[in-house]
């Protein structure tokens, strides 16, 4: 297993509709054709997997049907969007990138993006 650098923004504020987007960029040491991206959430010293997708370079990211994540890739960048977020989902969202094929296997873990989600005040048709 070889290490790889992964960069992501330090802070992102979710929209009033509970949507947060950020870019996860990795320094690919070679020409990977199969990449796996995993989003982890760290809160209260617990780490949980939010979503994961494997994609072939040049193709769309495919998350599971019931995933709260969507994404697109462009070169060594992955644009991730997480939806359905509310204040209790505030936390550190860590981007983990694995270069699965061809060998050698590379693993990179970002420092995390702190996503802040704010509960709106009671008002007509606001998003919570």
């Amino acid at each position: 297993c070889k290490a790889m650098h992964v960069a992501q923004p330090a802070v992102v504020l979710a929209s009033s509709r509970g949507i947060a987007s950020f870019v996860c960029e990795y320094a690919s040491p070679g020409k990977a054709t199969e990449v796996r991206v995993t989003v982890l959430r760290q809160a209260d010293s617990q780490v949980t997997e939010v979503c994961a997708a494997t994609y072939m370079m040049g193709n769309e990211l495919t998350f599971l049907d019931d995933s709260i994540c969507t994404g697109t890739s462009s070169g060594n960048q992955v644009n991730l969007t997480i939806q359905g977020l509310r204040a209790m989902d505030t936390g550190l969202y860590i981007c983990k990138v694995e270069l699965m094929y061809p060998p050698p296997y590379y693993l990179g873990i970002g420092n995390g993006t702190q996503i802040y989600v704010i509960d709106p005040e009671p008002c007509p048709d606001s998003d919570f």
Partner: antibody
Framework: QVQLVQSGAEVQKPGASVKVSCKAS????????MHWVRQAPGQGLEWMGI????????NYAQKFLGRVTMTRDTSTSTVYMELSGLRSEDTAVYYC????????????????WGQGTLVTVSS | DIQLTQSPSSLSASVGDRVTITCRVS??????LNWYRQKPGEIPKLLIY???SLQSGVPSRFSGSGSGTDFTLTISSLQPEDIATYYC?????????FGQGTKLEIK
């Protein structure tokens, strides 16, 4: 096991207020949102509002703005729904239901409901 | 306000039939939709969340699909205990509006 236990049936006069309680047990109270949903006799489900027991913030359906107040008491793991200016069309069964944050592992929304509280508004 | 419209409002089917209920939403909600079953005199029970995730303990004859504005609940083989009213609901964002319900009866 998870339980949401609501207060008993109420009969109120038009113009009065009613306060229904929902006591949670079997899970971490402040880790789940709580909703209030009502159902008039023979009618469908109607969402009233949501409260975050952690911070106490709430959000209400437009229809109930100015008439409903949702509060919580973390010391007793209880949420309250108070509806004022009661009218006959407020006669309904009122339910509380819990709702985890979307990132909670194996968390499903509205997975547990209270048994319901019948509020009758009659002169 | 966001509107959820279920169709049909009521339907009658035979035991063993494949039954489909649809829910149309007035704006794009991605996959953030729940389905419930409410039997007469009982509290609502969550069947499907996030459009297609089967809630724990719910029989596999229930399935959900759809995204955006059009969603479907399917019962692959209707059972007598499925006599109930079924509701869709927008979730994870206020207002958490319900559809008007679909009353399912056995022929």
């Amino acid at each position: 096991q998870v339980q949401l236990v609501q207060s008993g049936a109420e009969v109120q006069k038009p113009g009065a207020s009613v306060k229904v309680s929902c006591k949670a047990s079997g899970y971490t109270f402040t880790s789940y949102y709580m909703h209030w949903v009502r159902q008039a006799p023979g009618q469908g489900l109607e969402w009233m509002g949501i409260i975050n027991p952690s911070g106490g913030s709430s959000n209400y359906a437009q229809k109930f703005l100015g008439r409903v107040t949702m509060t919580r008491d973390t010391s007793t793991s209880t949420v309250y729904m108070e509806l004022s200016g009661l009218r006959s069309e407020d006669t309904a069964v009122y339910y509380c239901a819990r709702d985890p944050p979307i990132t909670m592992v194996r968390g499903a929304p509205f997975d547990y409901w209270g048994q319901g509280t019948l509020v009758t508004v009659s002169s | 306000d966001i509107q959820l419209t279920q169709s049909p409002s009521s339907l009658s089917a035979s035991v063993g039939d494949r039954v489909t209920i649809t829910c149309r939403v007035s704006q794009d909600i991605s996959r953030l939709l729940n389905w419930y079953r409410q039997k007469p005199g009982e509290i609502p029970k969550l069947l499907i969340y996030r459009a297609s995730s089967l809630q724990s303990g719910v029989p596999s004859r229930f399935s959900g699909s759809g995204s955006g504005t059009d969603f479907t609940l399917t019962i692959s083989s209707l059972q007598p205990e499925d006599i109930a009213t079924y509701y869709c609901q927008r979730t994870y964002s206020a207002p958490y509006t319900f559809g008007q319900g679909t009353k399912l009866e056995i022929k």
